[in-house]
């Protein structure tokens, strides 16, 4: 189907939605992916929660938002921002970013275009 895109909801609308959802399961899911199932991630008590469960919870939370590329981008950027200080080195940052980029696909959403995940002012 051919379509011309109109506006996708303004930034404040997406910001409100991102503020409203709980992104912790997404953060935990990604940290588990990059740390490995065996290692503990001491910022959260995740020992009893398998990564696949966290992924489902993450997808459920993201599903609460308006399904636009703009809002998805804001959510991913917020996750990156939240976890930035916990990522210990450049390699970990890159791993986290790679997993973050795969998140929409894992949740059967379309990956956002034009989404700059380097949002931490050089900290990450």
């Amino acid at each position: 189907m051919r379509r011309e895109r109109g506006r996708q909801g303004d930034s404040s609308s997406c910001e409100r939605q991102v503020d409203r959802v709980n992104l912790k399961p997404c953060e935990q899911h990604i940290m588990q992916r990059i740390m490995g199932e065996q290692e503990q991630y001491d910022s959260y008590d995740i020992r009893s929660t398998r990564s696949s469960d966290q992924q489902q919870r993450c997808c459920d939370e993201l599903n609460e938002m308006e399904n636009t590329q703009r809002c998805m981008c804001e959510a991913l950027q917020q996750i990156m921002e939240n976890q930035c200080d916990r990522l210990q080195d450049r390699q970990m940052v890159q791993q986290f970013k790679r997993e973050l980029m795969n998140l929409p696909q894992q949740c059967n959403f379309r990956a956002p275009q034009r989404c700059d995940l380097d949002v931490s002012g050089g900290r990450c």
């Epitope: 895109r5 506006r7 996708q8 980029m101 275009q113 034009r114 989404c115």
Partner: antibody, heavy 123, light 110 residues
Framework: EVQLVESGGALVQPGGSLRLSCAAS????????MTWIRQAPGKGLEWVAN????????DYLDSVRGRFNISRDNAKSVLYLQMNTLSADDTGVYYC????????????????WGQGILVTVSS | QSVLTQPPSVSAAPGQKVTISCSGT????????VSWYQQLPGTAPKLLIF???KRPSGIPDRFSGSKSGSSATLGITGLQTGDEADYFC???????????FGGGTKLTVL
């Protein structure tokens, strides 16, 4: 070598129509976003419209939406800009550009530009 | 009036370094990638920087890009007389669903 050659520029009266064409060569046309950008005499650059690789998505500058239509023929490697209800504000050099935007986690950037074609709207 | 703000002009002597700023908002530079263009008099613009910091092949490393928050910066070191041109920043604005260009900065090499 990538080449973008615009044609169709002219002097046209206010309220008139014009169709610009851009013949592309030297790359696989069907795999790139394409973009029209214009520049009024002595002024800065102004983005006009984007079109996705398969033509399924189009974006327009607010002031041209509903008057201009961007389209493409991937079989011929040609980009078009149909311009209707033209006004003096539409006067300028129109550039056909290749847009490096990919499907995710990248931005719009214009890595190849045509030489530009002059559109003058005046009575 | 451009939504992306650039200084109208900057100048420096040959061999010196110059920076050109591009200021926007959260809905454009803050969330999206920035590119930079050089337009020599009477010619079509040329891409210098894309995705904030990347240089296309053929662009010397005298040119660099950076981004922090809602602002971006183009740096040019070892200025040459051939660098005299207009420089434009550009990015997507998610609220407008449009690409925005800055108003342009005229670089004079003294």
């Amino acid at each position: 070598e990538v080449q973008l050659v615009e044609s169709g520029g002219a002097l046209v009266q206010p309220g008139g129509s014009l169709r610009l064409s851009c013949a592309a060569s030297g790359f696989k046309f069907s795999t790139f976003y394409m973009t029209w950008i214009r520049q009024a005499p002595g002024k800065g650059l102004e983005w006009v419209a984007n079109i996705k690789q398969d033509g399924s998505e189009k974006d327009y500058l607010d002031s041209v939406r509903g008057r201009f239509n961007i389209s493409r023929d991937n079989a011929k490697s040609v980009l078009y800009l149909q311009m209707n209800t033209l006004s003096a504000d539409d006067t300028g050099v129109y550039y056909c550009t290749r847009n490096g935007l990919q499907d995710s986690y990248s931005g719009d950037f214009f890595d190849h530009w045509g030489q530009g074609i002059l559109v003058t709207v005046s009575s | 009036q451009s939504v992306l703000t650039q200084p109208p002009s900057v100048s420096a002597a040959p061999g010196q370094k110059v920076t050109i700023s591009c200021s926007g908002t959260g809905s454009n530079i803050g969330h999206n990638y920035v590119s930079w263009y050089q337009q020599l008099p009477g010619t079509a613009p040329k891409l210098l920087i894309f995705d904030n910091t990347k240089r296309p092949s053929g662009i010397p490393d005298r040119f660099s890009g950076s981004k922090s928050g809602s602002s971006a910066t183009l740096g040019i070191t070892g200025l040459q007389t051939g660098d005299e041109a207009d420089y434009f920043c550009a990015t997507w604005d998610a609220d407008l669903s449009a690409v925005l260009f800055g108003g342009g900065t005229k670089l004079t090499v003294l």
